[in-house]
């Protein structure tokens, strides 16, 4: 008895595809060993057709795949475009040779069934419309026309030219003639359901002179498209239901036992389990739409169906498309924090992972909005202007080669709470969702800037100080000047190594920035922050206004994030005549619903690629005392 298990007999028809699941005992060795699918020859040799080591035979090229699901202790062999030559005996198995553990599978591929010459075969998907063509001779031009469905020996009338319609076909069947045609009538049956399948006979006239045509109607359940995605990655369901439902409400549902539970529809319904990580995007006027789900979880695996109906809910007899989603737990996408907490007036540093092989890809950060279909307008990007309302408090720090970039948002308010997405114009699987929770602050912020009303006078020296607590003693402190394409760190160097200290005076920890002499272009937002290597921590922001010597009181743009603090003797200072090269890239905020839209935005930004980079300090000089 083999411990491997699978289907003993698999049957299909030419042109179709099969998906064969083989089950193996749950052991570490089994999970990682080679999986194979081979064809048994008459000589007893089993020739490998495909294996998990990457081998693919010539006859399977472009039409087969083998995927291992170690978390389920299964592997799946998918074979498409079947022909009768595929009929035969196979083995699915484990091991370095084809003599290891295996299970025998018999595959039989039949021809598409043939009918007598006078039978026309109609093959339609559930929910679609079939038009049955019925030919007759001129002698029956004025005779009664009808369509009946064979049930055993009887043939029950579906519709006839006297306006009779069988109740089960009410509002679905119509009998008509086209133009001046005198030898054909047609019957349309819409909203097809599985029970409509069968043999129909259309008839013109009565008795022996009647003209009869046979029609075999096959109503197909949608063949689920198999989707294999990694944990924490994203999936896009592309739904094309046809023009006839272009104006009906669309939905995506997930089959749950006997029902199909709506996840999202165009009428505003959305499953709370997908809050913050789903977008439905209409594609065109022909009823095409896509649904993107990010941050895939193990429990997202299952059967999905998209459809259209005025109610926004699944209805029998309406067109659907189906998928089976598998979520592989052996993911290349690292586990990152899904919830980040902040306080009002404070800041958050969000680390966004991306495919390390694509360090040059454009990085973006967008805010998921819960309007009826969900949308995610871009707030900041490597070459994208910071959106209105986020000036001076949002920046993206790219760390090429690290496989991550950091987004910092400060001057937090409770309105900032919500879902945000990290995404790039590269590998579409690397989209992560973060929920930001902002609570009311209950204590003073860790970083405080003085003076709070920062007004500098042209030509003079201006110093602002940033007070930090002892817990940041060992971390790197920095000042940066915020601009629309990042926050450019101001150069600094320590004069003499910092003295190691057993005690830390809470009141004397300061990092200062000096502008000497002040120039008009020094006006703007400055951030004081802490970091350890590539890991960014707390930040606070201050707006520095610049005025002429002769001018009166300037316009000041203070922020709640800054609180007055005491002067202190011990300080790290940065002196800088800040020269900002603002290389701005234009990128319209976009709804990043799928790869194409990200690509479009990326192309646009690529043309405007700026030479400056967040985190660089081009054109700035300074010293610390």
């Amino acid at each position: 008895q083999s411990p491997i298990f699978g289907p003993q007999d698999v049957s299909s028809i030419e042109g179709n595809s099969v998906s064969i699941t083989c089950y193996y005992p749950d052991t570490s060795v089994n999970r990682h060993t080679r999986k194979y699918w081979c064809r048994q020859g008459a000589n007893g040799y089993c020739a490998t057709l495909i294996s998990s080591n990457g081998y693919l035979s010539k006859e399977y090229s472009g039409r087969a795949s083998l995927i291992n699901f170690p978390e389920n202790s299964t592997f799946v062999i998918n074979i498409a475009h079947l022909t009768q030559e595929d009929t035969g005996s196979y083995k699915c198995g484990l091991g370095t040779t084809n003599r290891g553990l295996f299970f025998d599978v018999s595959l039989e591929v039949s021809q598409v069934p043939e009918f007598p010459n006078d039978t026309h075969v109609y093959t339609k998907d559930i929910g679609r419309t079939v038009t049955i063509e019925c030919r007759f001779k001129e002698g029956n031009a004025h005779s009664k026309k009808s369509l009946c469905k064979k049930r055993g020996e009887a043939c029950e009338v579906v519709i006839d030219s006297t306006e009779y319609v069988d109740p089960s076909y009410k509002d679905r069947a119509i009998l008509f003639m086209k133009g001046t045609s005198r030898d054909i009538f047609y019957v349309n049956i819409s909203h097809l359901i599985p029970s409509d399948a069968g043999l129909y006979v259309c008839q013109a006239g009565e008795g022996p002179s009647a003209d009869k045509n046979n029609a075999d109607l096959q109503v197909l359940e949608p063949e689920p498209e198999l989707l294999y995605k990694d944990l924490r990655s994203s999936v896009t369901f592309e739904c094309d239901l046809g023009r006839e439902v272009a104006n009906d409400a669309k939905y995506l549902c997930r089959k749950n036992k006997e029902t199909c539970d709506v996840i999202i529809n165009t009428l505003g319904k959305r499953d709370p389990a997908f809050e913050g990580r789903i977008l439905l995007t209409p594609r065109d006027d022909n009823g095409r739409f896509s649904v993107l789900i990010t941050g895939l979880r193990k429990e997202d695996a299952g059967h999905y169906q998209c459809g259209a109906h005025s109610s926004g809910l699944p209805q029998e007899g309406w067109p659907v498309q189906a998928w089976q989603l598998f979520v592989n737990e052996e993911s290349t996408i690292p586990n990152s924090r899904s919830v980040v907490k902040g306080v009002t007036g404070g800041s958050v540093a969000i680390v966004c992972p991306y495919n390390p092989k694509e360090s040059s890809s454009l990085k973006y950060w967008c805010h998921w909005e819960a309007d009826e279909n969900g949308r995610c307008p871009v707030l900041v990007g490597t070459q994208a202007l910071v959106q209105e309302g986020y000036e001076g408090r949002l920046a993206l720090f790219d760390q090429p080669g690290s496989g991550a970039y950091t987004v910092i948002l400060n001057q937090l308010t409770t309105q900032d709470s919500g879902f945000y997405w990290c995404l790039t114009d590269g590998d579409s699987r690397w989209r992560t969702t973060i929920e930001l929770q902002v609570a009311e602050a209950t204590k003073k912020p860790d970083l405080e800037v003085t003076p709070q009303n920062a007004t500098a006078v042209i030509g003079e020296t201006f110093t602002i100080s940033c007070h930090y607590p002892c817990k940041f003693y060992s971390q790197e402190k920095y000042w940066c000047k915020w601009s629309n394409d990042g926050c450019h760190i101001l150069p600094s160097h320590d004069e003499g190594a910092r003295q190691s200290s057993v005690s830390c005076d809470q009141s004397s920890q300061i990092v200062s920035m000096t502008l000497n002499p002040v120039k008009k272009e020094d006006e703007g937002w400055y951030w004081c922050g802490v970091k350890e290597g590539q890991v960014y921590g707390e930040t606070t922001a201050i707006y520095v206004a610049v005025e002429e010597r002769t001018r009166g009181s300037p316009h000041i743009n203070p922020t709640d994030a800054n609180a007055r603090a005491k002067d202190a003797p011990e300080e790290e200072a940065m002196e800088s005549s800040v020269r900002e090269d603002e290389n701005k890239a234009n990128l319209d905020p976009r709804l990043f619903a799928d790869e194409r839209e990200i690509q479009n935005a990326g192309d646009q930004a690529q043309e405007n690629r700026a030479s400056g980079n967040a985190g660089s300090a081009g054109g700035q000089s300074g010293s610390s005392k």
């Epitope: 007999d9 698999v10 028809i13 064969i20 197909l220 359940e221 689920p224 006997e258 029902t259």
Partner: nanobody, 127 residues
Framework: EVQLVESGGGVVQAEDSLRLSCAAS????????MGWFRQAPGKEREFVAA??????????YYADSVKGRFTVSGDNAKKTLDLQMKDLKPEDTAVYYC??????????????????WGQGTQVTVSS
Amino acid sequence: EVQLVESGGGVVQAEDSLRLSCAASGLPFSSSRMGWFRQAPGKEREFVAAIGWSGRSTYKYYADSVKGRFTVSGDNAKKTLDLQMKDLKPEDTAVYYCAAHPDYYGDPRTSGAYRYWGQGTQVTVSS
């Protein structure tokens, strides 16, 4: 209300044949998988055979103990399931249960892969 009704059980001699049938009513979808399980007195319910449909392909599964003797068949659209049993043995004596699920996933040998169950039909094989 979903109902699975088994029929065809009875008392037969060893090496005889028997055909079990199952009809499903009230299933909201065409079922994607139907199976047969059996339970002998004092024993746990065990998998016998199953059939799965996906698109226009059919997948048949058998327990090692019945391979070559039992044949499963069914009609997805009509929601019917049959089990042709040949060369019956006394150890095949059990209550045979029909099971169905609207989706085609999960290990067909496990009862958790099925949502609906029939009341069972008794098969007794005397030596």
